[in-house]
């Protein structure tokens, strides 16, 4: 009779993490009598995965009933596969012996490869806000994928970025891998509504890449421009001065009026108008009683935006001449003004 051969028909098997791997093995004969064992690896360091004769192997089930007398199918299923299960599995026939069974024939081995999906990319921006024309760095991280091959791209508002550096760790072999990428982005005044996207493509994602996003609204600070104008006279002895605070982001803003260097009033931006680009405008009025002043008055609008050092704009109010109408510089976008006229 022809000598028993152990057949492992699959040279390789590819399984997604969490799924069940089927490792096929058949024998060509019932003789010699003896058990089958499955090992991961060969040589003296091989690991026992399943022993037909004895032992407890909770993750392993046999495909067919090994207790049946004529059974020659020794295929097994390994449940809940993780990347750590990758390796070559050998189906080994043992011959009954005394006191111990002896190894008789080994299959050619089946290489088990495990695919694991990358985690959703997490994009994080700088800790502190930056102003337009500055370059800021964004990082993107994704973990737990296998195999190592992966593609990462960066986009800003749909346009692919080229200034980035990517590392996949570890450099050697691992049960799973991580990717870390840093992209440099130059901010513009129009970036309040902009998005930075990190896109990760991996064989496990079947052409449907994972994306992580960061809103530049969390990163950008657009400093305001100030304009102080004198409005037409409201009463014989009163002058209305406005401070237009334009194109700022974020909204956090505090305005202080100074008369000849003395604090007159402080207020916080509340009823702001939003521009199409996501920046804000705000207007504050100050009603000045001219008759209370003997000399010319220097009015200063001082703005502290988002915790930054204050910026200011001044306007000289001539008291000696009779107050007349001086060009009102209001723009259409400034209609949402603050009408709390406090003196």
């Amino acid at each position: 009779e022809e000598e028993l051969q152990v057949i492992q028909p699959d040279k390789s098997v590819l399984v997604a993490a969490g799924e069940t791997a089927t490792l096929r093995c058949t024998a060509t004969s019932l003789i010699p009598v003896g058990p089958i064992q499955w090992f991961r690896g060969a040589g003296p360091g091989r690991e026992l995965i399943y022993n037909q004769k004895e032992g407890h192997f909770p993750r392993v089930t046999t495909v067919s009933d090994l207790t049946k007398r004529n059974n020659m199918d020794f295929s097994i299923r390994i449940g809940n596969i993780t990347p750590a299960d990758a390796g070559t599995y050998y189906c080994v026939k043992f011959r009954k012996g005394s006191p111990d069974d002896v190894e008789f024939k080994s299959g050619a081995g089946t290489e088990l490869s495990v695919r694991a999906k990358p985690s959703a990319p997490v994009v994080s921006g700088p800790a502190a806000r930056a102003t337009p024309q500055h370059t800021v760095s964004f990082t993107c991280e994704s973990h737990g994928f296998s195999p190592r091959d992966i593609t990462l791209k960066w986009f800003k508002n749909g346009n692919e970025l080229s200034d980035f550096q990517t590392n996949v760790d570890p450099v050697g072999e691992s049960v799973s891998y991580s990717i870390h990428s840093t992209a440099k982005v130059v901010l513009t005044r129009e970036d309040v509504h902009s998005q930075v996207i990190c896109e990760v493509a991996h064989v496990t994602l079947q052409g449907d890449p994972l994306r992580g996003t960061a809103n530049l609204s969390e990163t950008i600070r657009v400093p305001p421009t100030l304009e102080v104008t004198q409005q037409p006279v409201r009463a014989e002895n009163q002058v209305n001065v406005t401070c237009q605070v334009r194109k700022f982001y974020p909204q956090r803003l505090q305005l202080t009026w100074l008369e000849n260097g003395n604090v007159s009033r402080t207020e916080t931006a509340s009823t702001v108008t939003e521009n199409k680009d996501g920046t804000y405008n705000w207007m504050s009025w100050l009603l000045v009683n001219v008759s209370a002043h003997r000399d010319d008055v220097k009015l200063t609008c001082q703005v502290e935006h988002d915790g930054q050092p204050a910026v200011s704009k001044s306007h000289d109010l001539k008291v000696s001449a009779h107050p007349k109408e001086q060009g009102s510089n209001t723009a259409a976008e400034n209609t949402g003004s603050n009408e709390r006229n406090i003196y």
């Epitope: 060969a42 003296p44 360091g45 390796g87 008789f104 080994s106």
Partner: antibody, heavy 122, light 112 residues
């Protein structure tokens, strides 16, 4: 093409510890044994020990109490540490890859490093 | 430990002529699966050893077919059908059945 490169000090003082690293490039660490073999000047080859991809180690009993082999798959490296060295440990140290695919035995040490000379002297 | 004994210690050869090296093990290297776990290596002067034969008779990749291995159990032989000048060096047998792996003392092949 798999290549192995040994690195470490060429001179070690008696009673100190010899530390060598072997960097594996161009191939996988999986499914192989990673071995250290030495050759004293003008003498034959002596197997020191090896480590499998699962971290299991096997040592030559004549050196076991002094030798530790470790594997860092993430760096594609494996290392040899030997304590309490004497002049008798002066040798060329080779790192090598050992194949295994046919049961309990081994199927050839098929890739060798170029060897690094270690002298034990004060 | 398995003791490996090689002979001869030195082998002067003539290019183009055959050569033969013997290796004996203190216990059988034939495992129950039918494989004989014996390797042959050649260490050329100033170089690292190179695998020639594994499992007693299987030629390693890239090894010229003038090298052949035979034997089983405890007696093994490496034959070179026609020696070439590049074959000079020390030939070692090594048992790969069990740890510690052990080498023979080596056979130095040199041109006459």
């Amino acid at each position: 093409q798999v290549q192995l490169q040994e690195s470490g000090p060429g001179l070690v003082r008696p009673s100190e510890t010899l530390s060598l690293t072997c960097t594996v490039s161009g191939g996988s660490i999986r499914n192989y044994y990673w071995s250290w073999i030495r050759q004293p000047p003008g003498k034959g080859l002596e197997w020191m020990g090896f480590i499998y991809d699962n971290g299991r180690t096997f040592y030559n009993p004549s050196l076991k109490s002094r030798v530790t082999i470790s594997l860092d798959m993430s760096m594609n490296q494996f290392s040899l540490k030997m304590t309490s060295v004497t002049a008798a440990d002066t040798a060329v140290y080779y790192c090598a890859r050992v194949r295994a695919y046919s049961g309990i035995g081994l199927d050839g040490t098929d890739v060798w490093g170029q060897g690094t000379t270690v002298t034990v002297s004060s | 430990d398995i003791v490996m004994t090689q002979s001869p210690l030195s082998l002067p050869v003539t290019p183009g002529e055959p050569a033969s090296i013997s290796c004996k093990s203190s216990q059988s290297l034939l495992y129950s699966n039918g494989y004989a776990y014996l390797d042959w290596y050649l260490q050329r002067p100033g170089q690292s050893p190179q695998l020639l034969i594994y499992q007693g008779s299987n030629r390693a990749s890239g090894v010229p077919d003038r090298f052949s291995g035979s034997g089983s159990g405890t007696d093994f032989t490496l034959k070179i059908s026609r020696v070439e000048a590049e074959d000079v060096g020390v030939f070692y047998c090594m048992q790969a059945l069990q740890t510690p792996l052990t080498f023979g003392g080596g056979t130095k092949v040199e041109i006459k």
